[in-house]
Interface confidence: low
Amino acid sequence: EVEKTACPSGKKAREIDESLIFYKKWELEACVDAALLATQMDRVNAIPFTYEQLDVLKHKLDELYPQGYPESVIQHLGYLFLKMSPEDIRKWNVTSLETLKALLEVNKGHEMSPQVATLIDRFVKGRGQLDKDTLDTLTAFYPGYLCSLSPEELSSVPPSSIWAVRPQDLDTCDPRQLDVLYPKARLAFQNMNGSEYFVKIQSFLGGAPTEDLKALSQQNVSMDLATFMKLRTDAVLPLTVAEVQKLLGPHVEGLKAEERHRPVRDWILRQRQDDLDTLGLGLQG
């Protein structure tokens, strides 16, 4: 902790500017008024303060706002955000998407830190739901964000937000998460025509029930094997050989290469050998 010392004559800061980089830590503590700092936070990032000097500036803000910083200060924290602990951030009430973007920008290119995770959690919980603009922003910065949420958290995603989801945002989602997201996607894309609908829904199909797969098999969708392999085993098992053939179209030949893997293996074991033989792939039930 920096000792309280009087500010030397003539060194009292009238504004936040480059002259402060020559101040020692104790001079910053003594000569920079915390309220002045708070109102001119936007200038701090343009000044090449050392990490030690930033510690002093953070300390001054902490003293001025022991209950947590106001959003007007948070929005302009810039690199000072990297000095915050999750404990600091839990005191904040961030409601503006612009503030969230400004802070995510500071951390851009790095993995999601506990500070950022706490910030996002505060922001989303404060809004009450993960709306489209927020999801758009978060997945732009962190493509894996959606799959880092629990099924319970995903349940607060409104169907309208699903339009912001890109296929790569779902790469690391597990079946429990897709179970929650699929019905929302189905609702979001329900007014699209067949081929367009399939392009949009494809990434979410790991959460699709049997009846939806049966319906898709009637629409000449030509599902690729990568998508088929991600389907729920319990949803695939009741499909007939004819339905799988229609679902996969020209990709049906790929079943041979996947015959030892779930869900193909389990599905093959469920089928009559006569039916499998109609595929001409040499699959053995």
């Epitope: 999750p86 506990p114 995770a117 919980k125 880092s148």
Partner: nanobody, 119 residues
Framework: QMQLVESGGGSVQAGGSLRLSCTAP????????MDWYRQAAGNQREWVSS????????SYADSVRGRFTISKDPAKDTVYLQMNSLKPEDTAMYFC????????????WGKGTLVTVSS
Amino acid sequence: QMQLVESGGGSVQAGGSLRLSCTAPGFTSSDCDMDWYRQAAGNQREWVSSLLSTDGSTSYADSVRGRFTISKDPAKDTVYLQMNSLKPEDTAMYFCRCVVAEWGGMDYWGKGTLVTVSS
């Protein structure tokens, strides 16, 4: 009321190591963001490290980064603080804290374990 229990403190020479443990009997550590704090005699309590429940990511105060490591064993509902290259200025009472990972969540503290580092 949940009670966290710290252990593993003790006396050690500068440069030595200790591993602190924090258990929450009857409570799942996966429900918590887990923090370690410390308080040296006559000083304010200061944050040392955090481990988030959501994705297991970790964070450290500048004064301990590179020397301390926070981790957890979900099977035992125990959170650890591995402290290496200890310095005399690390001497303090160490506390663990569980912040129930919810908006405006409850938090729970342990009674602390003392770490003394002599030069």
